[in-house]
């Protein structure tokens, strides 16, 4: 009977029905497991740890974008428990390739040492 329930559902013994696992709120992630018919007795939601965020539901908390360290960009908006960080323009000494599709992270800045002549962010 349990296996008839979906990914985020548990089998409710009282009603004999599949029931939605309680979704977490923004800034929280599931603690222990719930789904496919079973629910851990102590299943619940816990706040995201530092430097991570979640939009809620059944998502685990994810690390904020590292604008400066990974993307070599300025921080437009720092992340909090509910929102990812937003990156701004490239750091000094870095530039963004024009007319290039953004990757899954949105943007990456490249060192001016590799820039073509007259790249505006690298002039001067």
């Amino acid at each position: 009977e349990y296996s008839n329930c979906g990914e985020n559902e548990y089998y409710n013994q009282t009603t004999g029905l599949c029931q939605e696992c309680p979704p977490c709120g923004p800034g929280e992630e599931p603690y222990l497991s719930c789904g496919y018919g079973t629910k851990d007795e102590d299943y619940g939601c816990v706040p995201c740890p530092a430097e991570k965020f979640s939009k809620g539901g059944y998502q685990i908390c994810r690390r904020h974008k590292d604008c400066e360290g990974f993307f070599r960009a300025t921080v437009l908006t720092p992340g909090d428990m509910e929102n990812d960080a937003e990156c701004g323009p490239c750091l000094p000494g870095y530039y963004m390739l024009e007319n290039r599709p953004r990757n899954i992270y949105g943007m990456v800045c490249y060192s001016c040492l590799l820039a073509p002549p007259n790249t505006k962010e690298c002039v001067g």
Epitope: N4, E9, T14, T15, G16, L17, C18, E20, P23, G57
Partner: antibody, heavy 118, light 108 residues
């Protein structure tokens, strides 16, 4: 096949109680819940409560103080009782049930038109 | 409680026309818990679509359902005279179970 048949009075005096019986066939009351829903004249559908297969109940908070749902599994009967009826309780009262692991109203009784009037 | 808002409240359509009725929930509902019913005057409601997109037994294939989250819809691919009725959405996610206020479909 699955059937739900309702029996109960059509006329109830103000402040009196309403009793309706829903007799089911084609499934076991020990396995499935039976819901009660009403529809006031010209209005929409209002969920009142449910008795689950295991015998526990859930009620709409607006009716919890005057509503009681019980059952007799061996007779395949569910009993609905609402106290202290007033004119605005005039409605068609339905029992309904489901099958499978999700709670949708796959089967409905024929409805009992209840008029609250002196 | 979860409030379901249906639109439009009433509508008239010509035979052969495509009809869409929407149901908006006040909070997120998993698609497994949203259902649709058809009611004709003098009759009990009849199950139409369960779990968002599954046709109940005997329901013509011109009916379909879709949606997720807080936004769901019922579509009649080509309106027929026998489709004149009131349509209700319903959620089975939480207690109390709730219904939309209904959409009355008439024929032009």
């Amino acid at each position: 096949q699955v059937q739900l048949k309702q029996s109960g009075p059509g006329l109830v005096q103000p402040s009196q109680s309403l009793s309706i019986t829903c007799t089911v066939s084609g499934f076991s009351l020990s396995n499935y819940g039976v819901h009660w829903i009403r529809q006031s004249p010209g209005k929409g559908l209002e969920w009142l409560g449910v008795i689950w297969g295991g015998g526990s109940t859930d009620y709409n908070a607006a009716f919890i103080s005057r509503l009681s749902i019980s059952k007799d599994n061996s007779k395949s009967q569910v009993f609905f009782k609402m106290n202290s009826l007033q004119a605005d309780d005039t409605a068609i009262y339905y029992c309904a049930s489901y099958y499978g692991y999700y709670d949708w109203f796959a089967y409905w009784g024929q409805g009992t038109l209840v008029t609250v009037s002196a | 409680e979860i409030v379901l808002t249906q639109s439009p409240t009433t509508m008239a359509a010509s035979p052969g026309e495509k009809i869409t009725i929407t149901c908006s929930a006040s909070s997120i509902i998993s698609s497994n818990y949203l259902h649709w019913y058809q009611q004709k005057p003098g009759f009990s409601p009849k199950p139409l679509i369960y779990r968002t997109s599954n046709l109940a037994s005997g329901v013509p294939a011109r009916f379909s359902g879709s949606g997720s989250g807080t936004s769901y819809s019922l579509t009649i691919g080509t309106m027929e005279a026998e489709d004149v009725a009131t349509y209700y959405c319903q959620q089975g996610s939480s207690i109390p179970r709730t219904f939309g206020s209904g959409t009355k479909l008439e024929i032009k």
